[in-house]
C-alpha cells in the first residue's frame, strides 16, 4: 500500500493526529521535501546575523552578517569581526601586521612583503602594513647614481608573529 | 568526513557549572589542537580556549580564566570544557573547532573546520 504521506508537498506536514491529511506548515516553520511528518522551525537571525533571506514554507531562512563582520560555517553559522586593512584577526582580536608584512583587505592574515631581490629586482615603493613593496626594475637596469631603496628585513613566517 | 558535534549545553543559574563536550570523528584527533570559541548574541566570535594535540598545553582567554578548564581524552576522540561560576555574559552558543596542527598558542586562529554548536544560557 502506498504511504498517503507521500502524497504531501512541500510545504506542508503529514498531520497523525488529522488522519494523515495534508497540513500547511504552521508560521515561523517549513518543510523543504514532501512526505515530512513535521516541519522544521525556521532559523532567525538575531543580533550580529541579519536576514538575507526571508523563511517561507518551503525554504528555511539565511542570514549573514550585519556590517563590521563576515560569515564563517556551513550557512553563515558564525559571524566574525572584521579588522581594518594593515591588521589581522587574532585570538584575543585585531592587531597590526608586524614589520615587514602587510594585510590589504578586512579578513585574514598579515603577509610577508614580497622580496624583490629575489626576483633580481630593487624596491621601487616600499611596503607599508596596508601594502605590499612594489618591485621596479633590477638594480643593474637603473642608471647610474640612482638611488635604490634598502630591501626590507627578512619577514617572518605567518602564523608565527610575536604580539 | 571530517565531524565535530558539541553537546552539554543548556540553561544555567549564575554561579553554576556546566561541562561541554565535543566528539570528533574522521580524522586523527591526537594529531590536532582543539579549540572552543564562542558567539553571544550581539556579538562576533570570540576566542575562549585551545589545547594542543597532546594536552599538554593549553591556552585561555582573559575572560574565562580561572573558571574555564579545557581538556582533552585522546583514546575517545573526545574534547572538553569545564566552566565553572557561570556569569551572564558566557551566555552564547559554544563552538568545538579542529585547528590545522598539533600545537597551538593564544595568537592565531588556524581553524579549519568547526562544530555546529551548543547553546549555553546563563541565566536566574
Known amino acids: 500500500l502506498q504511504d498517503p504521506c507521500s502524497n504531501c508537498p512541500a510545504g506542508t506536514f503529514c498531520d497523525n493526529n488529522r488522519n494523515q491529511i495534508c497540513s500547511p506548515c504552521p508560521p515561523n516553520s517549513f518543510s523543504s521535501a514532501g512526505g515530512q511528518r513535521t516541519c522544521d522551525i525556521c532559523r532567525q537571525c538575531k543580533g550580529v546575523f541579519r536576514t538575507r533571506k526571508e523563511c517561507s514554507s518551503t525554504s528555511n531562512a539565511e542570514c549573514d552578517c550585519t556590517p563590521g563582520f563576515h560569515c564563517l560555517g556551513a550557512g553563515c553559522s558564525m559571524c566574525e569581526q572584521d579588522c581594518k586593512q594593515g591588521q589581522e584577526l587574532t585570538k584575543k582580536g585585531c592587531k597590526d601586521c608586524c614589520f615587514g608584512t602587510f594585510n590589504d583587505q578586512k579578513r585574514g592574515i598579515c603577509r610577508p612583503w614580497t622580496n624583490c631581490s629575489l626576483d633580481g629586482k630593487s624596491v621601487l615603493v616600499n611596503g607599508t602594513k596596508e601594502r605590499d613593496v612594489v618591485c621596479g626594475p633590477s638594480p643593474a637596469d637603473l642608471s647610474p647614481g640612482a638611488s635604490s631603496v634598502t630591501p626590507p628585513a627578512p619577514a617572518r613566517e605567518p602564523g608565527h608573529s610575536p604580539q | 568526513e571530517v565531524q565535530l558535534l558539541e553537546s552539554g549545553g543548556g540553561l544555567v543559574q549564575p554561579g553554576g557549572s556546566l561541562r561541554l563536550s565535543c566528539t570528533a570523528s574522521?580524522?586523527?584527533?591526537?594529531?590536532?589542537?582543539m579549540s572552543w570559541v564562542r558567539q553571544a548574541p550581539e556579538k562576533g566570535l570570540e576566542w575562549v580556549s585551545s589545547i594542543s594535540g597532546s594536552g599538554g598545553s593549553t591556552f585561555y582567554a582573559d575572560s574565562v580564566k580561572g573558571r574555564f578548564t579545557i581538556s582533552r581524552d585522546n583514546s575517545k576522540n573526545t574534547l572538553y570544557l569545564q566552566m565553572n561560576s557561570l556569569r551572564a555574559e558566557d551566555t552564547a552558543v559554544y563552538f568545538c573547532?579542529?585547528?590545522?596542527?598539533?600545537?597551538?598558542?593564544?595568537?592565531?586562529?588556524?581553524?579549519?573546520?568547526w562544530g555546529q554548536g551548543t547553546t549555553v544560557t546563563v541565566s536566574s
Open positions: 574522521g580524522f586523527t584527533f591526537s594529531n590536532y589542537a
Open positions: 573547532a579542529k585547528e590545522g596542527s598539533s600545537e597551538t598558542d593564544d595568537h592565531y586562529y588556524n581553524v579549519d573546520v
